[in-house]
Interface confidence: low
Amino acid sequence: MSQDTEVDMKEVELNELEPEKQPMNAASGAAMSLAGAEKNGLVKIKVAEDEAEAAAAAKFTGLSKEELLKVAGSPGWVRTRWALLLLFWLGWLGMLAGAVVIIVRAPRCRELPAQKWWHTGALYRIGDLQAFQGHGAGNLAGLKGRLDYLSSLKVKGLVLGPIHKNQKDDVAQTDLLQIDPNFGSKEDFDSLLQSAKKKSIRVILDLTPNYRGENSWFSTQVDTVATKVKDALEFWLQAGVDGFQVRDIENLKDASSFLAEWQNITKGFSEDRLLIAGTNSSDLQQILSLLESNKDLLLTSSYLSDSGSTGEHTKSLVTQYLNATGNRWCSWSLSQARLLTSFLPAQLLRLYQLMLFTLPGTPVFSYGDEIGLDAAALPGQPMEAPVMLWDESSFPDIPGAVSANMTVKGQSEDPGSLLSLFRRLSDQRSKERSLLHGDFHAFSAGPGLFSYIRHWDQNERFLVVLNFGDVGLSAGLQASDLPASASLPAKADLLLSTQPGREEGSPLELERLKLEPHEGLLLRFPYAA
């Protein structure tokens, strides 16, 4: 009987003979078993027990070099070799052709647009430092302690001030290079800039000159003021600010030419610096004339505040604006400085947050918009800058006037709050390509509704459906309004609703979509070739 033993290939040592001279059936009896199948990288070697049997086996040491060459040169082998070589090259060329066809036919990845930092998320305005911080603590050092909060909102820029020295209506006592000592020192400002940079928050400085006075631009001394602004731009750019805001430009004579000049200074320093202009105007033609002469200017206005809060009218305003501005970058807000609650009833705040974060452009908010801060609910507080409600002690004037759900503290505890919705939307806005720079297509969904798609190339797509009405509505999504590149699927997953109660992540049939009063839905669906 022969005994099968398994030998690891690494342990098999070949003897000193050249490979072609090694005996295939040596007298020692170490013969390769023809039946010895390979198993897990091991070779079965049959050890012959009967030496006589092994010795009797004929010795064969393979072909000599001359014999091998003679056989290899025979017509049969030559033909076989040529056939194999031809097959190899045909196979190779076939694979190459296949690869070329696949590459040529595959849809091109769309080239990403140049993205400036203000394209990547929201801006947050703090026009009144003291109101923002409360408890009479409104200074730059205190604001530094609130940067963590701004980080948690995932906003990209802080629009600060004005904080410069300004004696009401007195040009001589207005110094755009000096920080009002009530707000702190230049050192405090530098320290704030450093901390903000570490948290990836850009700082935009408001340089509206006569912010405490009647006319923001001292209407009679425009040239003097314009020179002051030019000097201030250069000074603060050197100090490290990321941009500037000037408001009430409808009160500035020759605003377009001044803005063009200031834009040149700002962009001349770095393309990464931003100029924001604000106007109280809601007139599209006036807005467009300001934009026409200033490439890259971000303009905040009261344009959307005229929407009358109906779906059709809002859709019409948005689409008109986007069509008129072409492919230039927009900003979205309801005013140049005021809170959303100045224009909207409480039940529409969530809807507008969802809309502002998902329209193509930069959403711009005022401090307090994220919690629905409402001056009207705080007796004695100024409409334009009510105290920020951090917690229930933020408004000690009238005990019990502030309940937990009105405050940052209370809303932070509640995943269903307006603040939590703001944080979620801000997070999505800053990381999803379709929301960052995707195409926009509005389409019909029925009366009272405003719906649109955001999509970028082969990335995940987003569908927004907004019910501005105070009755529940069925959405009849008219996909026929959409180009082929933005077609609707039968189902889309619910990313979030502005109302509680829907199961997030669940697929919704778009043909049977029903929205609650004042409900907004953000749905997502994959690209399909």
Epitope: S403, A404, N405, E413, P415
Partner: antibody
Framework: EVQLQESGPSLVKPSQTLSLTCSVT????????WNWIRKFPGNKLEYMGY???????YYNPSLKGRVSITRDTSKNQYYLQLNSVTTEDTATYYC?????????????WGQGTLVTVSA | QIVLTQSPAIMSASPGEKVTISCSAS?????MYWLQQKPGSSPKPWIY???ILASGVPARFSGSGSGTSYSLTISSMEAEDAATYYC?????????FGAGTKLELK
């Protein structure tokens, strides 16, 4: 210091109603969110719902309308009712209060009460 | 609802060993929260806002992650760390928990 204490029967028959009370000391239930959470024998935790400072409620949809959370502000207590119980509802029930505020997180839990559903 | 999947379900580690527990969310969450529970006790807040240690938590613990993928790490296992750890999200209602990771001492 905030303390929460659950109380109620430890044995409930199938199809009956499970009722638990959470007594709160050191904080007022008219502030914040007051939750019920349960832990099944296999260690799985399930959020059941809350009653808020204003009395508004939220219930986990998985409980299919069987759950109700109420409160009595004068006693500083809030309550859980779970109808039509089955053996699947056997769990340790916790009342809990969480506070999340910027860079703060507190979660106060009761010690838990084991409720067995059995005939 | 957001489903949190924790792994491993059970693990054992020797004193001094590095331990990592993972938690994966079915959709993106802004932050992850971690609880520690020992037999006979209620769960305790352990790590919040993904990486901030709750009061009294030893510095050998750390948390990291973003989007849908988060983890809790113990740089050097100690006997008192043996417990069940749960991840939890506060992103949206219903609040949800991972199934827990039971960490035992080898």
């Amino acid at each position: 210091e905030v303390q929460l204490q659950e109380s109620g029967p430890s044995l409930v028959k199938p199809s009956q109603t499970l009722s638990l009370t959470c007594s709160v000391t050191g904080d007022s239930i008219t502030s914040g969110y007051w939750n019920w959470i349960r832990k099944f024998p296999g260690n799985k935790l399930e959020y059941m719902g809350y009653i808020s400072y204003s009395g508004s409620t939220y219930y986990n949809p998985s409980l299919k309308g069987r759950v109700s959370i109420t409160r009595d502000t004068s006693k500083n207590q809030y309550y859980l009712q779970l109808n039509s119980v089955t053996t699947e509802d056997t769990a340790t029930y916790y009342c809990q209060r969480h506070v999340i505020y910027d860079y703060t997180w507190f979660a106060y839990w009761g010690q838990g009460t084991l409720v067995t559903v059995s005939a | 609802q957001i489903v949190l999947t924790q792994s491993p379900a059970i693990m054992s580690a020797s004193p001094g060993e590095k331990v990592t527990i993972s938690c994966s969310a079915s959709s993106s969450v802004g932050y992850m929260y971690w609880l520690q529970q020992k037999p006979g006790s209620s769960p305790k807040p352990w790590i919040y806002r993904t990486s901030i240690l709750a009061s009294g938590v030893p510095a050998r613990f750390s948390g990291s992650g973003s989007g849908t993928s988060y983890s809790l790490t113990i740089s050097s296992m100690e006997a008192e760390d043996a417990a069940t750890y749960y991840c939890q999200q506060y992103q949206s209602y219903p609040l949800t928990f991972g199934a827990g990771t039971k960490l035992e001492l080898k």
